[in-house]
């Protein structure tokens, strides 16, 4: 066969679907690789061909579109499973071609089993809710295109294993789940089960997502430098090790980049001719506020080093702050010569 532009196996789009549920999978060529859509390609006389490689096999084979009840079908640039089976797992390829043009891409599809409490190896999307922020909603994800707008599905929401009804601050509202006032106790996995009829059959779509309650923007502040501070003086003798921790608290801020850095005499530590090492550790609170600690260390400090200014800087979307460490050379204690005068007393 003639040459085909092969985009390889697109592992970025690791598609996971539940067993015994409908799945609609769009050919990734039009979404991520080509500059035109399916309609344009179709009008230009290009044909979309699907085939697959079963799990643990090397042989590419055509997809059987003649299964009972049209279990697998293709519609435009979508491959449909109504429903999936466990052994549908494999690498799927969509190829767009005519006599002069060819382009193809493969992607992995994994059919996943779930237990009665919706536990599974499925990678779950995370939805962040602000703590005590007023009404916030999550929406049952990835259900568009499964049924026409004329069909009114039934939607049941679960938290973990439990059906959500008569919960204090969580109210199911069709495709949405409303949190009246999100609290830490609302952290967990939430599942919507969408049930709809199609051609005399009933299908279920199960979608689970993780809700994580995070710090509210109402409470967000610029970074707070806890150390260095005015109360601690780093008093060292030449030759000793100088260790200065910079500890910074960052409020949780959606999509904010938290940065901490040291300067020595205003410069990047790498640009100074001293042997400096900086080690960083990061910890998070339950609401994803972050504490970063960067420890600056100079193994054998010189008297020149003790005259420099060591400043810790921090920045987030809320602002920038800086704090200088109080570093000084230890004044050696004076050495007293004690003279003992011995008096001989005559009696």
């Amino acid at each position: 066969s003639e040459r085909c532009d092969d985009w390889g196996l697109d592992t970025m789009r690791q598609i996971q679907v539940f067993e015994d549920e409908p799945a609609r999978i769009k050919c990734p060529l039009f979404e991520h690789f080509l500059k035109f859509n399916y309609s344009t390609a179709h009008s230009a006389g290009l044909t979309l061909i699907w085939y697959w490689t079963r799990q643990d096999r090397d042989l590419e084979e055509p997809i059987n579109f003649r299964l009972p009840e049209n279990r697998i079908s293709k519609e435009k640039d979508v491959l449909w499973f109504r429903p999936t089976l466990l052994n549908d797992t494999g690498n799927y390829t969509c190829m767009l071609r005519n006599t002069t043009y060819c382009s193809k891409v493969a992607f992995p599809l994994e059919v996943v089993q779930k237990d009665s409490c919706f536990n599974s190896p499925m990678k779950l999307p995370v939805h962040k809710l602000y703590i005590e922020y007023g009404i916030q909603r999550i929406t049952c994800p990835n259900v568009d295109g499964y049924f026409p707008s004329s069909v009114k599905p039934t939607i049941t929401w679960y938290m973990g294993c439990y059906k959500i009804q008569n919960f204090n601050n969580v109210i199911p509202e069709g495709m949405n789940l409303s949190f009246l006032i999100a609290l830490i106790s609302n952290n967990g996995n939430y599942t919507c089960v969408v049930t709809y009829p199609e051609n005399g059959r009933t299908f279920h779509l199960t979608r689970t997502l993780t809700v994580k309650v995070v710090g509210s923007p109402k409470n967000a502040v610029p970074p707070v430098i806890h150390s260095p501070n005015d109360h601690v003086v780093y008093e060292k003798e030449p030759g000793e090790e100088l260790l200065i921790p910079c500890t910074v608290y960052f409020s949780f801020l959606m999509d904010s980049r938290n940065e901490v850095w040291w300067t020595i005499d205003g410069k990047k530590p790498d640009d100074i001719t001293i042997d400096v090492t900086i080690n960083e550790s990061i910890s998070h609170s339950r609401t994803e506020d972050e504490t970063r600690t960067q420890i600056l260390s100079i193994k054998k400090v010189t008297s020149e080093d003790l005259k420099r200014s060591y400043v810790c800087h921090a920045r987030s979307a809320k602002g920038e702050v800086a704090k200088a460490a109080k570093v000084k050379q230890k004044v050696p204690a004076p050495r007293y010569t004690v003279e003992l005068a011995c008096g001989f007393g005559a009696t």
Epitope: W261, G266, D271, V311, E320, A322
Partner: antibody
């Protein structure tokens, strides 16, 4: 080093672009500030550009002055110049590596003189 | 816009003496400490002395001391030398946005 250029005698209303050429450091590491000084007067802040490339201008300069940069130059574009804009224009580098604000600047050019006169 | 008000000019003192220049901000500077002090002599660009309210810039003698926080700052020059005769400026950065940086009006120091 930092060096300003582009200052000259112009008539009111004329646009003018001043260029600050830097060497020995990266503009991705340091913020740059523009400051001016009218004859016999104090220093006046015009605006700055942060290491990330975002530029800010003083409220009085907004709309008339814009700051932009390339990899080795920082430009100050001025429009609708008036006699009040007569000054020596300085460009300076922030003293502090990677800081947003160049309020503390250690590397200054000698300045370029802009005279607006009819 | 933010305003930095400095001690009125001129301030004079004898060689070997001490001078203090105050700088008051109409609003707290960023982080309460984003304030710098400069020295400027005629025909020269400013020279950075102090940054972060009290940190000495490289190569600046320890006779220059910055202090203060929030809205009130001071520059103290001790053991005055004739070479210290110059105009001194404070400069602040404000967190509201970049358009709100400012210089003080300057204070001339005369050394007798």
């Amino acid at each position: 080093s930092v060096e300003e250029s582009g200052g000259r005698l112009v008539t009111p209303g004329t646009p003018l672009t001043l260029t600050c050429t830097v060497s020995g450091f990266s503009l991705n590491d340091y913020a740059m500030i523009w400051v001016r000084q009218a004859p016999g007067e104090g220093l006046e802040y015009i605006g700055f550009i942060e290491p990330g490339g975002r530029a800010y201008c003083a409220s009085w300069a907004k709309g008339r002055f814009t700051i932009s940069r390339t990899s080795t130059t920082v430009d100050l574009k001025m429009t609708s110049l008036t006699t009040e804009d007569t000054a020596t224009y300085f460009c300076a580098r922030s003293y502090v590596f990677y800081s947003t604000y160049p309020y503390a600047s250690d590397l200054w050019g000698q300045g370029t003189l802009v005279t607006v006169s009819s | 816009a933010q305003v930095l008000t400095q001690t009125a000019s001129p301030v004079s003192a004898a060689v070997g003496g001490t001078v203090t220049i105050n700088c008051q901000s109409s609003q707290s500077v960023n982080g309460n400490n984003y304030l710098a002090w400069y020295q400027q002599k005629p025909g020269q660009p400013p020279k950075l002395l102090i940054w972060l309210a009290s940190s000495l810039a490289s190569g600046v003698p320890s006779r220059f001391k910055g202090s203060g926080s929030g809205t009130q700052f001071a520059l103290t020059i001790s053991d005055l030398e004739s070479d210290d005769a110059a105009t001194y400026y404070c400069a602040g950065a404000y967190s509201t946005s970049g358009e709100e940086n400012a210089f003080g009006g300057g204070t001339e120091v005369v050394v007798k």
